[in-house]
Interface confidence: low
Amino acid sequence: QERRFQLEGPESLTVQEGLCVLVPCRLPTTLPASYYGYGYWFLEGADVPVATNDPDEEVQEETRGRFHLLWDPRRKNCSLSIRDARRRDNAAYFFRLKSKWMKYGYTSSKLSVRVMALTHRPNISIPGTLESGHPSNLTCSVPWVCEQGTPPIFSWMSAAPTSLGPRTTQSSVLTITPRPQDHSTNLTCQVTFPGAGVTMERTIQLNVSYAPQKVAISIFQGNSAAFKILQNTSSLPVLEGQALRLLCDADGNPPAHLSWFQGFPALNATPISNTGVLELPQVGSAEEGDFTCRAQHPLGSLQISLSLFVHWKPEGRAGGV
């Protein structure tokens, strides 16, 4: 003989995969104080409970350890706690109170649990800016994870030199010492919920500040193709009267400030061009000598020089033979 009672609250609850949900249940007010029994949560259509406080009763293998009956008859509590929710927990459940000694039991109304795909993603936080050669602590956190669930497994993926720092149930710290070549590369934090077999990840692009490592000069002579100088050069022969375009480029992040100087400049020298481009429309005696491109950056500067050697056209020289 069964007596029915209504579960308070909603008829259905939603939980995301891997997370937790509490199915509320209050024992019927008509329950006699002397009623002694065990509580069982069942899946609709199943005869093996998913959770119980009956020590002699087996529970479903797949829910064992994840589904818990929060049993407190004094407070009339018969709620069901579900952790590490899995897609396959998607079902209707009901609570049954059975007495070993009395002829009748109590059966609750049904409540549906809907398990949805996990939409939350980990957060990656970076304190300030990442600077080449300087260690920084990155934190991957999953603040939406419930404490009672199986702790997630954190995995980090990065090409940069790293070491693992401390971790909690909800976060993991990675110490990264980036190099210039790590700028714009991907760093991924992957979080796996072993209880539900769900993995989520977030990927960010590293923004690494670094001083210029390479500076180069491209030389355009008239309409001819450019050629590139990657190191200081003693002399570059050019014809008198020829148009010359010198283009300087450098790496570095944020981009270095490029400027051109004639000669080998002192630190406070005045540039002849405040960009990476130096136009020499007609090379003459004034242009013979050294030109320096300087790449200035808050984290360090770099410069490269080339020396122009002017070839004179025979008919162009006064007193020419």
Epitope: L43, G45, A46, E61, E62, T63, R88, D89, A92, S112
Partner: antibody, heavy 122, light 106 residues
């Protein structure tokens, strides 16, 4: 008595699609996962995917994603599978099968349809 | 995915003989199910959750195993047992079946 009645033999051309049905009776259709299994002539069993008619939640074997589509009409207690872009490799018997319990798969696939035979030929 | 390897592929036995077929998993599984299939028929649930006989299955059948190694044993084979037996797991997605062991009677 639980019964799963599948639609009849199908002969189809390459490139076509077929939709087969699995009509159920004798139990609460919306409370159990329905699985589909493929068996090529003289071969073993291959799991295609499963659908929970209670909310149409479905999950597929990666191999059959885009090839098979599972649906369910609760008012008719009937599950459907559509197989598209047919090739000779799709010639097989397709079974629908009920899973014994929703949560644990503890009882395995406890009821099976009689199978729908699909032959792909030009 | 977890691969289930069944051996032997073909098992030939005389009536009254004891036979054992095995199912090995490429990774540990919590339990497996066994199905019996006869030519022209659907598979039937035979043993569920490693060792529990499905409804109507004769008591001469038994199942055992754990981890990666499972087996189905028939204590005294009868003519009606001639069939192909498939093992199946669902400890990880996708569920997979073994290739089957065909039991023939001499």
């Amino acid at each position: 008595e639980v019964q799963l009645q599948q639609s009849g033999t199908v002969l189809a051309r390459p490139g076509a699609s077929v939709k087969m049905s699995c009509k159920t009776s004798g139990y609460t259709f919306t409370s159990y996962w329905m699985h589909w299994v493929k068996q090529r002539p003289g071969q073993g069993l291959e799991w295609i995917g499963t659908i929970y008619p209670g909310n149409s939640d479905s999950t597929y074997n990666q191999k059959f994603k885009g090839k098979a589509k599972l649906t369910a009409v609760t008012s008719a207690s009937t599950a459907y599978m559509e197989v598209s872009s047919l090739t000779n490799e799709d010639s097989a018997v397709y079974y629908c099968s009920r899973e014994g319990t929703v949560v644990a798969n503890y009882y395995g696939l406890d009821y099976w349809g009689q199978g729908t035979s699909v032959t792909v030929s030009s | 995915q977890i691969v289930l390897s069944q051996s032997p592929a073909i098992l030939s036995a005389s009536p009254g003989e004891k036979v054992t077929m095995t199912c090995r998993a490429s990774s540990s599984v919590s339990y497996i199910h066994w199905y019996q299939q006869k030519p022209g028929s659907s598979p039937k649930p035979w043993i569920y959750a490693t060792s529990n006989l499905a409804s109507g299955v004769p008591a001469r059948f038994s199942g055992s195993g754990s981890g990666t190694s499972y087996s189905l044993t028939i204590s005294r084979v009868e003519a009606e047992d001639a069939a192909t037996y498939y093992c199946q797991q669902w400890s990880s997605k996708p569920p997979t079946f073994g290739a089957g062991t065909k039991l023939e009677l001499k």
